[in-house]
């Protein structure tokens, strides 16, 4: 008959918690990869694509060895919230143009949201300081043209792909230290 009401739950194994977060991150990374392939196939666009509103990549090689769990989770959550906002914006602003990618974009948004909730849960289970609510971000301006929106889609998916690789690397390294 479980613990009495009001008593704290037995804390789960932090390595197992971290492991499940890594796996969810990797499955989101695979979704992102598949969607990027589709985007490149249907809307080819050479060269680098940048979007000033996207977060800058969190990590460099030297810093990876000195990572601390609170800073990784905090930064990852902030960056993924930004990407979630950008994916939502993309779906709204480019609905008709990106219709062929719509089911996958919707799935990506759902999984991104799920990963964010998992990160929040992990932070509370590990008793890490909770962040204050994010201040409302300024609205993203609609793309100037269909082509501008497609370039934005390339930038968003490319940045998300790289951010998720950084996240997996950081979390796996941290897991070995727990």
């Amino acid at each position: 008959p479980g613990p009495p009401p009001g008593s704290p739950r037995a804390s789960p194994d932090p390595r197992a918690e971290l492991d499940s977060t890594v796996l969810l991150t990797r499955s989101l990374l695979e979704d992102t990869r598949q969607l990027t392939i589709q985007l490149k196939d249907k809307f080819p666009a050479d060269g680098d694509h940048n979007l000033d509103s996207l977060p800058t990549l969190a990590m460099s090689a030297g810093a990876l060895g000195a990572l601390q769990l609170p800073s990784v989770l905090t930064r990852l959550r902030a960056d993924l919230l930004s990407y979630l906002r950008h994916v939502q914006w993309l779906r709204r602003a480019m609905g008709s143009s990106l219709k062929t990618l719509e089911p996958e974009l919707g799935t990506l948004q759902t999984r991104l949201d799920r990963l964010l909730r998992r990160l929040q849960l992990l932070m509370s289970r590990l008793a890490l300081p909770q962040l204050p609510p994010d201040p409302p971000a300024p609205p993203l301006a609609p793309p100037s043209s269909t082509w501008g929106g497609i370039r934005a889609a390339h930038a968003i998916l490319g940045g998300l792909h790289l951010t998720l690789d950084w996240a997996v690397r950081g979390l796996l390294l941290l897991k070995t230290r727990l």
């Epitope: 492991d19 499940s20 796996l23 969810l24 991150t25 990797r26 499955s27 990374l29 695979e30 990869r33 990549l57 990590m59 460099s60 090689a61 990876l64 792909h161 790289l162 998720l164 690789d165 950084w166 997996v168 690397r169 796996l172």
Partner: antibody, heavy 119, light 111 residues
């Protein structure tokens, strides 16, 4: 054509170091990780580690931590693996391989570099 | 580390026959909708070649006679009708955790 071309065979004495290069062409270097795999005679293939060219951040198999060093030269689209404190068990073919980000499967391989460690 | 065990160690078949190669993992390598098992072919003096990734996805340029299946701990590579060029050693590899590890291989020989 996507290609990985590795440096030539090496013969080294025990205790020495070896540095192998792997030149990538035919794809955007930063879009994939570069992994390194060892194949010793009669042994299983063994993953040494990988590096993300954009971040420059290597991850190592604990078995090779401290002896293997992975680096990249982005401007030359070239990855390097240095193995130090060589011993006879390091005699093997070493492959570089292109890896999907954070998935660790390898869709393009170099031709392999034979390293022989012998006194 | 996860240990992969391949069976049989060697298999002698004739061209045109069906080949079934098995790979068993010491713990589940499937989760969150993906199975982290990949299959490679290697011929003497050559580098391995990716055939199947994430358990069942055929790598670009690989003939459709190759297929992969399975989940959890048991996986299979099937070659529906063997061609002369298919006689080689086949390795499975997992990437569920770090480090990724490989099976010991199955050598497919001409009968």
């Amino acid at each position: 054509e996507v290609q990985l071309v590795q440096s030539g065979a090496e013969v080294k004495k025990p205790g020495a170091s070896v540095k192998i290069s792997c030149k990538a062409s035919g794809y955007t270097f930063r879009d994939y990780n570069m992994d390194w795999v060892k194949q010793a005679p009669g042994q299983r293939l063994e993953w040494i580690g990988d590096i993300n060219p954009t971040i420059g951040a290597p991850i190592y198999n604990q078995k090779f931590t401290g002896r293997a060093t992975l680096t990249v030269d982005k401007s030359a689209s070239t990855a390097y693996m240095e193995l130090s404190s060589l011993r006879s068990e390091d005699t093997a073919v070493y492959y570089c391989a292109r890896g999907e980000l954070a998935h660790w499967y390898f869709d393009v391989w170099g031709q392999g570099t034979t390293v022989t460690v012998s006194s | 580390d996860i240990v992969l065990t391949q069976s049989p160690a060697s298999l002698a078949l004739s061209p045109g026959e069906r080949a079934t190669l098995s790979c068993r993992a010491s713990k589940s390598v499937s989760t969150e909708g993906y199975s982290y098992i990949h299959w490679y072919q290697q011929k003497p003096g050559q580098a391995p070649r990716l055939l199947i990734y994430l358990a069942s996805n055929l790598e670009s340029g690989v003939p459709a006679r190759f297929s992969g299946s399975g989940s959890g701990t048991d996986f299979t590579l099937t070659i529906s009708s063997l061609e002369e060029e298919d006689f080689a050693t086949y390795y499975c590899q997992h990437s569920r955790d770090l480090p990724p590890t490989f099976g010991q291989g199955t050598k497919l020989e001409i009968k």
